[in-house]
Amino acid sequence: EEELQVIQPEKSVSVAAGDSATLNCTVSSLIPVGPIQWFRGAGPGRELIYNLKEGHFPRVTPVSDPTKRNNMDFSIRISNITPADAGTYYCVKFRKGSPDVELKSGAGTELSVRAKPSAPVVSGPAVRATAEHTVSFTCESHGFSPRDITLKWFKNGNELSDFQTNVDPAGKSVSYSIRSTARVVLTRRDVHSQVICEVAHVTLQGDPLRGTANLSEAIRVPPFLEVTQQSMRADNQVNVTCQVTKFYPQRLQLTWLENGNVSRTEMASALPENKDGTYNWTSWLLVNVSAHRDDVKLTCQVEHDGQPAVNKSFSVKVSAHPKEQGSNTAAENTGTNERNIYGGSG
């Protein structure tokens, strides 16, 4: 009588997550009487996957009808495969007894699960930084298998080279995660810039996944300030303008000070965007020169995005109050006690 053989023809089977896996097993004889069982892993810690004899295995079905006596095919199909199902599966023949006696095991079939990486999530720095500073962006993707994966970084379509990537765990696992940190040097023109993390994996059929982050979330472009005297009107009123330009984000508070005393505070809102994504804002004051004996020191104080205030001052010369319209005069840091009459912004 020939020796019983338990044949598992495939050494390995690779299946996409969500699909069904077929694990093949045939026996050369049905003698002696006794059940076939499927296990994942070997040794005392092995996990019972399917037992024809008893138990409830909702995801496992026999490929052939096990109730047919001439059936020597004990292959099984496992549905809805997940990365947690990866491992080596053994088809084992037992002789009926109390307990059942293990007679022979198949050589085992290694099931590997091809699982897609999750959509990459890109996160930027917690606080904004200004131009010329380097900020870090992190990209994370999880749950993929096998371990081999490619990650690239782009800024506005240009590939970046300053990044560090780790795939965890280092050893064998049912699924893996990738984490990459890229260092990006900011420029004043980066408000509309975007960083892209691109992940390529065998499960994606050449169609990589992308995660993006806008540099607008990471950058602060501090404003330029210029205070000018726009004109001397016929009614002895001087129009003083504070131009705040090329700033981002829009969160900005402007305060006019007359000789050190707060005159008016304004908040920027609903400003039109420049082509580069920055904003401009102009605020003006009308100063009645004839109502003052001394020069008036006007200060335009700008607090941008919670940063320390930036000041620019301008002195309105009362002693030399010309009655005709004058040309624009640049801001100075000298001035006297004067009070503004009117104000506005635009």
Partner: antibody, heavy 118, light 107 residues
Framework: EVQLVESGGGLVQPGGSLRLSCAAS????????MHWVRQATGKGLEWVSA???????YYTGSVKGRFTISRENAKNSLYLQMNSLRASDTAVYYC????????????WGQGTMVTVSS | DIQMTQSPSSLSASVGDRVTITCRAS??????LAWFQQKPGKAPKSLIY???SLHSGVPSKFSGSGSGTDFTLTISSLQPEDFATYYC?????????FGQGTKLEIK
């Protein structure tokens, strides 16, 4: 349809012989372990004998040496040769098919009556 | 030989009742235990194998449990056609042996 039909029962004197037959249809008898089970009138069930797919045979203690189980693959039939019959062998004899991998009984014949009496 | 002991030997119940029959083996039989139903003048019918698996066509009101030496057969809601004699059987090793039977009668 899977079916077992016994025949060959009857009245026999103590010490006499009888050969029971079981004709199988709807399946290949040689692919299954096959059994004989008996039941005396008003009594419980008693397993008598079995033949495995490899031709191996088994008997309950009280019939060893007197009964012989066999099969004829060409006729898809099972037999029980009963010699040296005793009054205690009087019973309905059932032909039973053993289950696929664990030999649990699944298909029963309708039975044939054996009466051993002088 | 392995001895199989059923209890009770007889049982009276009403239609709709839930009944339980027990079977004890004289030694560990793993779960190689079967249950059969027999009506007068008829061949036995296979109900359950490996202690808890229902044969094809057997209604789910029949259920079996147990492992080792102690086993039970439960009929969840008795119908008139369920009044019969029930036998347990071990088939872990030869000679296969049956319990003495439990006669289920209408009260």
């Amino acid at each position: 349809e899977v079916q077992l039909v016994e025949s060959g029962g009857g009245l026999v004197q103590p010490g006499g012989s009888l050969r029971l037959s079981c004709a199988a249809s709807g399946f290949t008898l040689s692919s299954y372990d096959m059994h004989w089970v008996r039941q005396a009138t008003g009594k419980g069930l008693e397993w008598v004998s079995a033949i495995g797919t490899a031709g191996d045979t088994y008997y309950t203690g009280s019939v060893k040496g007197r009964f012989t189980i066999s099969r004829e693959n060409a006729k898809n039939s099972l037999y029980l040769q009963m010699n040296s019959l005793r009054a205690s062998d009087t019973a309905v004899y059932y032909c039973v098919r053993g289950g696929v991998w664990d030999d649990a009984f699944d298909i029963w014949g309708q039975g044939t009556m054996v009466t051993v009496s002088s | 030989d392995i001895q199989m002991t059923q209890s009770p030997s007889s049982l009276s119940a009403s239609v709709g009742d839930r009944v339980t029959i027990t079977c004890r083996a004289s030694q560990d039989i793993n779960n190689y235990l079967a249950w059969f139903q027999q009506k007068p003048g008829k061949a036995p019918k296979s109900l359950i194998y490996t202690a808890s698996s229902l044969h094809s066509g057997v209604p789910s009101k029949f259920s079996g449990s147990g492992s080792g030496t102690d086993f039970t057969l439960t009929i969840s809601s008795l119908q008139p056609e369920d009044f019969a004699t029930y036998y347990c059987q071990q088939y872990v090793s030869y000679p296969y042996t049956f319990g003495q039977g439990t006669k289920l009668e209408i009260k």
